[in-house]
Every structure is written in structure tokens, then in C-alpha cells.
């Protein structure tokens, strides 16, 4: 039950996280015009990964896409790549995890397969979350660097009296959405990995049992008395109890499909 809950919760958290990563990637407000300590302008600039926008006080907003690929900064390209990789991995992870969910029955899929799929999706979510966090952090670092550079020469004198105000950019809402979403995807991935451990039945190490026969003592292992006890081939595939009791061959054929139903 706890495993199903952990797996389900991990899936939901990852789903929210990936939705957030997609939202952050599409958002226009990765960087916004810094209004602090600046003259009050009737124009507000903000930029995303795909386009830059200008919102005028009049309410008119104009956005322009970055129609060049080669002319864009390498860092921006890297951030785009990280976010897209994050989304792709996350989407595949979601697809895999849907089939791995314990509450969903698909044919006669074994728990071993579900455990493997849960682990795979978990790893994908972790990498996806890390990609998003890395992408957002790279962009944030780029902003901080540019911010201090533009602060150093915020007012560039032109002809003595005339001044040009340099637009400084600060963190936009998309960065915070990206960080939170990346974190959630990462947490979801960890939860899926934890659930995988519970899904995969651990090999039971049966201790040797001593049987005292009349005349001489012989130590038998559980498989050593097939003929006399009826634990032979006739019960090989018999499900004795859903809770976890196994037949002798099921102990050996790890992992079991009857574990934690």
C-alpha cells in the first residue's frame, strides 16, 4: 500500500513539475526590466527564451520572436537545449511511469517489469529536473553578470548633458517557476526510485533447516525433499498465498509477480 502511494505521489509530483517546466519554457518573462532605482518609464521590457516583449503604459503589448538561430548568444541556446531535453525526458518518463503504476493493470505485466519501469521513469524525472534547474540557473547567472555590467555603466554620457538610460534586466517569473518545477520533478523522480525498491521483491535467504531422522542426522535444504513432501513439480506454479508465501521455485525465480499485490 505504501509503495503504491509513494509511486502515485511521485507520478503526480513529477507531472506537476513537468507541466511547470513546459510552462516556464514557454513563458516570456525570463528576464524583466529592473524598475528599482531607475527612472519611471512608460514602457516595460521583458524577455523569454523565444521572444522579447514590450508592454507600454497604454496597455499595448508587442512581442517579437528571435527569428535568428546563429545570431543568438550561445548561453541562450544552451538554456533552450537544457529546457527542451528536460521536457522530452520528462514526457518520456511520464509515459513510462503510467504503465509502471501499480494501480494500473496491463495484461499480465510482471512486478519485475513494473519495478524496472518505475526506476527508469524515476531516473528520467531526476535528469529532467536537473536539466530544468541547470537551464534556469545558467540563465540566472547570465542575468546577474549582465546586471552588474550594465550597472557599472548605467548612464553612458552622450555629448555632456544628454544621457542614455541603459535598460537593466532582473529575474523574471519564469525563473522561479522553472526552479520550483525542476525541484518538483526531481522530488517526484526520487519518490519513483524509492517506490521501485518496494516494488522489487527482495530475494529471501532461507536458512538451512536440520531434520533429525532416526538413525542418522541429515541436514536438508528446502529443495532437498521434493519427492517425499509433495513440494515437487506439481505445485511449481501454484499461488499459495497473495501476501508473500512462495513456492520453492518462486524463491529462486527473482523477482516474484506475487509480491505486494
Amino acid at each position: 500500500m505504501a509503495v503504491t502511494a509513494c509511486q502515485g505521489l511521485g507520478f503526480v509530483v513529477s507531472l506537476i513539475g513537468i507541466a511547470g517546466i513546459i510552462a516556464a519554457t514557454c513563458m516570456d518573462q525570463w528576464s524583466t526590466q529592473d524598475l528599482y532605482n531607475n527612472p519611471v518609464t512608460a514602457v516595460f521590457n521583458y524577455q523569454g527564451l523565444w521572444r522579447s516583449c514590450v508592454r507600454e503604459s497604454s496597455g499595448f503589448t508587442e512581442c517579437r520572436g528571435y527569428f535568428t538561430l546563429l545570431g543568438l548568444p550561445a548561453m541562450l541556446q544552451a538554456v533552450r537545449a537544457l529546457m527542451i531535453v528536460g521536457i522530452v525526458l520528462g514526457a518520456i518518463g511520464l509515459l513510462v511511469s503510467i504503465f509502471a503504476l501499480k494501480c494500473i493493470r496491463i495484461g499480465s505485466m510482471e512486478d519485475s517489469a513494473k519495478a524496472n519501469m518505475t526506476l527508469t521513469s524515476g531516473i528520467m524525472f531526476i535528469v529532467s529536473g536537473l536539466c530544468a534547474i541547470a537551464g534556469v540557473s545558467v540563465f540566472a547567472n547570465m542575468l546577474v553578470t549582465n546586471f552588474w555590467m550594465s550597472t557599472a555603466n548605467m548612464y553612458t554620457g552622450m555629448g555632456g548633458m544628454v544621457q542614455t538610460v541603459q535598460t537593466r534586466y532582473t529575474f523574471g517569473a519564469a525563473l522561479f517557476v522553472g526552479w520550483v518545477a525542476g525541484g518538483l520533478t526531481l522530488i517526484g523522480g526520487v519518490m519513483m526510485c524509492i517506490a521501485c525498491r518496494g516494488l522489487a521483491p527482495e530475494e529471501t535467504n532461507y536458512k538451512a533447516v536440520s531434520y533429525h531422522a532416526s538413525g542418522h542426522s541429515v541436514a536438508y535444504k528446502p529443495g532437498g525433499f521434493k519427492a517425499s513432501t509433495g513440494f515437487g513439480s506439481n505445485t511449481k506454479n501454484k499461488k499459495i498465498y497473495d501476501g508473500g508465501a512462495r513456492t520453492e521455485d518462486e524463491v529462486q525465480s527473482y523477482p516474484s509477480k506475487h509480491d505486494y499485490v
Epitope: 518609464t41 512608460a42 521590457n45
Partner: antibody
């Protein structure tokens, strides 16, 4: 047809108060930011106050800050300018105007005269 | 506050003549985000409210004759009337639409010779 009609102008004594109104018609009032602009007897144009389309953002000329308040009622399609502690230098023809692209004032009212004199 | 300086303060012209008037701002009105200059030109005839002619320094408002042309960038702007007509005799104002307060120039009065 876009129309902006100002009202409420009068002759007031220094220190007095007045409320100007601007009735808008012919366009979706709630979609546009609005401003009050005044023209002094010397014919100089002076922007007075701005209000965003939803009314959440307002800006005022420093010399009128704390004395003038711009507001709007989108349900009534009306723009207001509440003026208090009036001074002789506030004597002007007050226009209400609509902002459009480039923050430009594309439509203006006919103007309303405010005279501050003892 | 941004100071808008218009020159000349008055211009005496003959019909059909080409006219240029200048407007200078104390700070650049160019917005780096969209590479547009937030400068507006208005025309005011006696007894009438100002009429919008040009916004974004060079974009003509619909219905404005194409003899009116706005140009310039940053801090220096020009309004050109290619062939002055009798109905163009008015006062022309430039306005900073970038920084608050939104300041106007003192105007250039166009008069007939």
C-alpha cells in the same frame, strides 16, 4: 465615433477643490489607459496624470502629487480628476485624452476650463 | 524630468514650401527592447485640442497626410512637412512618451508669410 466630454470646470478660490469628469463613448473604455493634460494660458501643454486601463496604476506630475487624484469608473465609462488645495498655477484648460500605441494620445476631449483666482 | 526643446519657436513659410522643425530631448527616448523611439508629434489649431500626427517618432497616425514625416532617433528628432498647405498652419508639439512625467516641448508655430 470616439468622444470624450469633460465637465466640472469652474472658477475656484485658491485652496479650493474641484472634481473634473470625462465621459467616454464610442470605444471600449476599459481597454484603454487615460490621461489628463492641461494647457496653460501661455499655451504650454503639461501632462498632469495617467491611469491604466484597469485603474491599478496611476502616475502624477510631481507638482500635483498629494493634491490631485486620478480615478476611473469603467462601469460608467468615466474618468475623474479630483483636485484639492488648488493654486493659481493650476489655472488651465484641462483635457482628458486616450492613450494608444506608442503611449500617444490619439483622442482628446474639447477641454474644460479651471480658473483658480481669489 | 525630461526636457523637450523645440526649435525654432516660430516659422514663417509660403504655401508649397518644405518645412522642417526640430525637437531634442535631454535623454534618449529609444527603447532597447523594441528599438522604437517614444516620441510623439501633435498638431494644434486655434480653439481645438491637439491632434495626433506621428508616434514612435516616425509612424504616421491613420488619416494623417503623407506630407508629414517624422524622423530621428535617440535624442534628436525632426518633423518634416514636404509641401506646406494653408491648413497646416498650426502649432506643433513634440512629446516624450517614454519617461514619466510625459513632457511636452514648448511648440513650433507655423505661420504664413
Amino acid at each position: 465615433e470616439v468622444q470624450l466630454v469633460e465637465s466640472g470646470g469652474a472658477l475656484v478660490k485658491p485652496g479650493g477643490s474641484l472634481k473634473l469628469s470625462c465621459a467616454a463613448s464610442g470605444f471600449t473604455f476599459s481597454k484603454y489607459a487615460m490621461s489628463w493634460v492641461r494647457q496653460t494660458p501661455e499655451k504650454r501643454l503639461e501632462w498632469v496624470a495617467f491611469i491604466s486601463n484597469g485603474g491599478s496604476y496611476t502616475y502624477c506630475l510631481d507638482s500635483v502629487k498629494g493634491r490631485f487624484t486620478i480615478s476611473r469608473d469603467n462601469a460608467k465609462n468615466t474618468l475623474y480628476l479630483q483636485m484639492s488645495s488648488l493654486r493659481s498655477e493650476d489655472t488651465a484648460l484641462y483635457y482628458c485624452a486616450r492613450h494608444d500605441k506608442g503611449n500617444a494620445l490619439d483622442y482628446w476631449g474639447q477641454g474644460n476650463s479651471v480658473t483658480v483666482s481669489s | 524630468d525630461i526636457v523637450m526643446t523645440q526649435s525654432p519657436s516660430s516659422l514663417t513659410v509660403t504655401a508649397g514650401e518644405k518645412v522642417t522643425m526640430s525637437c531634442k530631448s535631454s535623454q534618449s527616448l529609444l527603447n532597447s527592447g523594441n528599438q522604437k523611439n517614444y516620441l510623439t508629434w501633435y498638431q494644434q489649431k486655434p480653439g481645438q485640442p491637439p491632434k495626433l500626427l506621428i508616434y514612435w517618432a516616425s509612424t504616421r497616425e491613420s488619416g494623417v497626410p503623407d506630407r508629414f514625416t517624422g524622423s530621428g532617433s535617440g535624442t534628436d528628432f525632426t518633423l518634416t512637412i514636404s509641401s506646406v498647405q494653408a491648413e497646416d498652419l498650426s502649432v506643433y508639439y513634440c512629446q516624450n512618451d517614454y519617461f514619466y512625467p510625459l513632457t511636452f516641448g514648448a511648440g513650433t508655430k507655423l505661420e504664413l508669410k
